[in-house]
Each structure stands twice: as structure tokens, then as C-alpha cells.
């Protein structure tokens, strides 16, 4: 079934942008001016998820790349990765659970909770130039709040 999708960029609550760091990793750093063109453009899709009062299930792909953020266990720890998919089959309404994030909007801020690992969130570090990761704490040192910006084609 077709899905509703949009193109956007994400910045953490400290205004750090997300950029590629090697072929399968994202990092967060402050960008200005023309460097803003380096930031990753996501294709965010509305997918099927578990019933909830106000969490909206989404998948986060990299625009025009066959890569999706996914959550898997590595060394017994929930881990965020970029995973290659067959572009002929994605995005789809019934995404595998590892690709699904519960988008939570509070006061114009977004959180992305792993559907596979409840209470684990897409996170960035306070420090510059560090990998984007899956974190198991909210409200601590690590940043779990993001803002979204539509991308004009």
C-alpha cells in the first residue's frame, strides 16, 4: 500500500545538524552557511504501528538512498544503524519493526522512540561531531529532542 511521506531535515535541540559520517553512520555538529548543504535529508514515512494515544509511527529513510535508520541488538545493547534495503520494496506501510520509530511531538519538539525498544530514543551527544545513537535515557546529558524542517525541492 502507498504511504504518505515527506522530505525534511532534523536538528537537535542545540541546533546541531545531522550529516553522514562514513557510509553507515550519522553524526551531529553545528553547521552554518553553505555547509548546511551537507546535512542529511530524510524521507519520513507514515507507517503502521501499534495503537497509541499520541505516538505516530514513522520510518526514517535517507532521501534518494536505499538506507533506513533501524534499531537492532548489538552486544546485547539496542543500537541505531543505517541499513540498506531493496528500493523496489521500500517504503511500505508495514515496515519491519526495527525500522519503526514512534514520533512524539511536544511543544514543537520531536522525539523518536524506537518501536522495537520502548524508551530508547534517537539521541545526540552534547559534544560536537559525535555519532547519532540510540539512547536509553531522557532528560539527562544526551539530547533526545529535535526540530524538523521541510525541504523545498
Amino acid at each position: 500500500a502507498p504511504v504518505r511521506s515527506l522530505n525534511c531535515t532534523l536538528r537537535d535541540s542545540q541546533q546541531k545538524s545531522l550529516v553522514m559520517s562514513g557510509p553507515y553512520e550519522l553524526k551531529a555538529l553545528h553547521l552554518q552557511g553553505q555547509d548546511m548543504e551537507q546535512q542529511v535529508v530524510f524521507s519520513m514515512s507514515f507507517v503502521q504501528g501499534e495503537e497509541s494515544n499520541d505516538k505516530i509511527p514513522v520510518a526514517l529513510g535517507l532521501k534518494e538512498k536505499n538506507l533506513y535508520l533501524s534499531c537492532v541488538l548489538k552486544d546485547d545493547k539496542p543500537t541505531l544503524q543505517l541499513e540498506s534495503v531493496d528500493p523496489k520494496n521500500y517504503p511500505k506501510k508495514k515496515m519491519e519493526k526495527r525500522f519503526v520509530f514512534n514520533k512524539i511531538e511536544i511543544n514543537n519538539k520531536l522525539e523518536f522512540e524506537s518501536a522495537q525498544f520502548p524508551n530508547w530514543y534517537i539521541s545526540t551527544s552534547q559534544a560536537e561531531n559525535m555519532p547519532v545513537f540510540l539512547g536509553g535515557t531522557k532528560g539527562g546529558q544526551d539530547i533526545t529532542d529535535f526540530t524538523m524542517q521541510f525541504v523545498s525541492s
Partner: antibody, heavy 119, light 108 residues
Amino acid sequence: EVQLVESGGGLVQPGGSLRLSCTASGFSLSDAAMAWVRQAPGKGLEWVGIIYDSASTYYASWAKGRFTISRDTSKNTVYLQMNSLRAEDTAVYYCARERQIFSGDFVLWGQGTLVTVSS
Amino acid sequence: EIVMTQSPSTLSASVGDRVIITCQASQSIDNWLSWYQQKPGKAPKLLIYRASTLASGVPSRFSGSGSGAEFTLTISSLQPDDFATYYCQNTGGGINIAFGQGTKLTVK
């Protein structure tokens, strides 16, 4: 004050075109999803379509090909271009803001603008 | 495409009555359903989203329930301000966002 104001409605002949505008104040359209919903006189609500970023628009099956939604973020305005208009397109046209991205429901509505298609 | 069917189409009731309006989806939409109230000449007002969550500022006499394909809107004790037309809306079943045909609530 957060509000939406539609404009551009009026009388148009069958086969004609019209462009409706919806201007937002009190918030930025740069991260808001905006929909158009219409209501024929004495009838129910009918979803027309929705725009996210400028490349991501979705339409009711009956609206595809004749109706186009666009946005101008610098003017904080969303548009509905309507072509090949028919008598059955006569309706009040509302723009509305999606409550949250992909929530599919609409918490902020404009006052509506009446489009009459008649010769 | 998912079709939303409301019943009844019209409903006469008195102040203080308990009122129930039902909405049926042609296939399962989980809890992706909203309810709106509309008064003549006015824009619709969101009452309930995700089947059962009350929108901001909506009185607690309104409640929603259901999941899958069957949903209800209940007004526990009808007030004079509640006479209006009510619409259900599928908000999450695929690309399209479909409304029910409406239920007009009138004074008995």
C-alpha cells in the same frame, strides 16, 4: 493570534480555473502540514488533499489531475489551484493545519471561502 | 479506498439526554479516527482524536471509544450548545483522509 485566512473564492464558469489562497499568521508554514477540505452546500465534509514539503502532496482520488496544492513559505501561504471546474465543485473550501505531522486530523481551520461554478 | 459510514444520519434529542453516534470503517483503521463538531456557517471543530483522546478545551461530557472498524462518540448529558452536525474521520488508513457523511443532532 494563530489563524488561517482563505481568499480567492468567487463565481467561475464551468471549465474555468481559480486559485485559492490560505495565509497563516501566528505560526510558520515551514514545518506545518496543510490540507484543503471542501463542503458543498448542505452536504458533508470532503477531503481534497494535503501538502507537506513542496514535493510531497497527496490528493483525494477525485481531485488528482484537476487540483494542485502548493506553498510559498516566504509568504506563509498555501494555494489550491483548481482547473476544469464543474458545477459539482461548488462548495466552501477550508484550509486546515494538521495537528501533528501525519496525525491526519485538523485542529486549526480557516473561515472558508465560497466557490460557485455556474454559467 | 476506505469508506466511513455514520449512523444515524439525523438524531433528535433533548437537553440532558445521553447521545451515542456510531461510525463504521469499511476496513480496520486501528484507532486512527477523529470526531468533529460543526455548526452552521462555521468551520469544523476537532473534538476527539485517536478514537478516544479529548482535544484541548473540549468538555468532558464528550467521549470516544472503539478500535478497528467500529467507533462511537458519546455525549453523556446533552447541553444546548451541542446541537450541531458531527463527523467522524479516518486519519490513518493509507493515503486518503476520509470523512463520514455526518450526523445532524437536532432538538426533539
